[in-house]
């Protein structure tokens, strides 16, 4: 069985802080998925992008808001599985020759996903066919099912292409890389922020912002581009010293990507450890795959 959370190429040590983004080398984030949604039921066709993380040969973990249609405002309508394409092993969007693309067999949004405050912002995509695993396509580990989540000051990595304007065809995005912040996968290093500090930072701003117990925050008080670069739904991964594996502790949810660089506006992430049981139940994983997926 292939292992999770162990890229063939060692990720950089976490002593030196990264401000802003930096190019990822091929194979650094083998779990990284590009999710392309093309809603052809609408005129004009709606089209958007997000990130996700490979959990097994057949399952992608992402944020629910990436897979929700905006056609209805107060109703959570998942996009049709027929409108979803997932790219794995993708490094440079100008060259998809080494990438694997797969259509979706199922799209599963958390039943309690709330569009007003993004509580329970987590979802799964089941791939039509299992993807072949290798040096550039490997799963990430799930955390232990516990409510605490990552501790403040722990450093994690988030990767993404920063696709910002999808008014182009998928081929243009994948082949030419137009309308992306970067052609090459970028990553940033961010510290986890205490729940109290993050809650206070959002409460100090007028509005209906709610940092729930199903979320955690990361970023720097002084702001900067590091809060913008992760595509929605991408995994916030932390290295677990005990198991020597990388673990998906969070998913890019809201906050930072909307107000990039603002002082004391932290990125808010879905706390994956609160959903491990739900994820395993949905994936209906056999015992062996559970061993593979969950950090021991």
């Amino acid at each position: 069985l292939p292992v999770c959370g162990q890229p063939s190429r060692a990720l950089p040590n976490l002593v030196k802080r990264i401000i802003g983004g930096r190019n990822a080398e091929l194979g650094l984030f083998p779990w990284q998925a590009l999710i392309v949604v093309e809603d052809t039921s609408r005129i004009p066709n709606d089209k958007w992008f997000g990130s996700g993380a490979l959990l097994s040969e057949s399952w992608i973990l992402t944020a629910a808001h990436v897979l929700r249609s905006q056609r209805r405002d107060n109703t959570v309508i998942p996009v049709s599985k027929d409108h979803v394409t997932v790219y794995l092993g993708l490094h440079d969007v100008r060259d998809k020759s080494g990438a694997v693309n797969s259509s979706a067999a199922r799209v599963v949004l958390h039943p309690d996903f709330n569009i007003q405050n993004y509580n329970h912002d987590i979802a799964l995509v089941q791939l039509q066919e299992p993807v072949p695993l290798g040096a550039h396509v490997m799963p990430i580990c799930l955390p232990r099912p516990e409510p605490e989540g990552p501790a403040p000051h722990m450093l994690g990595l988030v990767a993404g292409w920063g696709i910002s304007n999808p008014n182009v065809t998928v081929d243009e995005i994948i082949i030419s890389g137009t309308r992306t912040l970067s052609d090459v996968l970028q990553y940033v290093k961010l510290p986890v922020v205490s729940h109290a500090e993050c809650k206070a930072s959002y409460e100090s701003r007028s509005g209906n912002y709610s940092v729930t117990e199903n979320m955690f925050c990361a970023g720097y008080y002084e702001g900067g581009k590091d809060t913008c670069l992760g595509d929605s739904g991408g995994a916030f991964v932390i290295f677990d010293e005990m198991s020597q594996r990388w673990v998906a502790q969070g998913l890019v949810s809201w906050g930072g990507p909307e107000e990039c660089g603002s002082k004391q506006v932290y990125g808010v992430y879905t706390k994956v450890s609160n959903y491990v049981d739900w994820l395993l139940e949905e994936m209906n994983s056999p015992r062996g795959v559970r061993e593979l997926q969950v950090e021991r």
Partner: antibody
């Protein structure tokens, strides 16, 4: 609290272009689409279309295809309405409203006067 | 496009008395998802519109319970049990079921 704050009144000549902004605050911006609604002087409301704030894809009602363009500056939480080649009949108040269909919160409106 | 017809055009009501506004659509507003996207808003003089009711009968937060919405298919009604001075303005219904969304012509509520 949830707020939509629009740019100030505009006085333009026929043939010119106007760009109206609608700064949103108090909610997760990319969670809701943004509609644009026109109200001619002394008249009722007419829905112009909406923009998906997550994908950036605009949808226009038939009467507003061509000279009208919706756009976004997501990092500034600001949708825009641009009207090109202004005509006298574009004189109206333009409202932004949160949601593609719900339109539950409205901006204060931007008055556009087109006169030679 | 779906035509939304509101009646009456103008409504003069004494404070404390009830009021009723009708809104009829040219086709059923029941969507394939089982919901009916019929909404009501109030535009007070010189102000921007404010939504009062969505999905036929659900009251927006802060809207007094003297307002009620009802109806189904093509016939809808907004009722005010006891009109107050702050209720004056123009009431619009609109539908969000069939593209493009369309508004009724409006009903002006005046205080006698």
């Amino acid at each position: 609290q949830i707020q939509l704050v629009q740019s100030g009144p505009e006085l333009k000549k026929p043939g010119e272009t106007v760009k109206i902004s609608c700064k949103a605050s108090g909610y997760i911006f990319t969670s809701y689409g943004m509609s644009w609604v026109r109200q001619a002087p002394g008249k009722g409301l007419k829905w112009m279309g909406w923009i998906n704030t997550y994908s950036g894809v605009p949808t226009y009602a038939d009467d507003f295809k061509g000279r009208f363009a919706f756009s976004l500056e997501t990092s500034a939480r600001t949708p825009y309405l641009q009207i090109n080649n202004l005509k006298n009949e574009d004189t109206a108040t333009y409202f932004c409203a949160r949601g593609g269909e719900a339109m539950d919160y409205w901006g204060q409106g931007t008055s556009v006067t087109v006169s030679s | 496009d779906v035509l939304m017809t509101q009646t009456p055009l103008t409504l003069s009501v004494t404070i404390g008395q009830p009021a009723s506004i009708s809104c009829k659509s040219s086709q059923s507003l029941l969507d394939s998802d089982g919901k009916t996207y019929l909404n009501w808003l109030l535009q007070r003089p010189g102000q921007s519109p404010k939504r009062l009711i969505y999905l036929v009968s659900k009251l927006d937060s802060g809207v007094p319970d003297r307002f009620t919405g009802s109806g189904s298919g093509t016939d809808f009604t907004l009722k005010i049990s006891r009109v107050e001075a702050e209720d004056l303005g123009v009431y619009y219904c609109w539908q969000g079921t069939h593209f493009p969304w369309t508004f009724g012509g409006g009903t002006k509520l005046e205080i006698k």
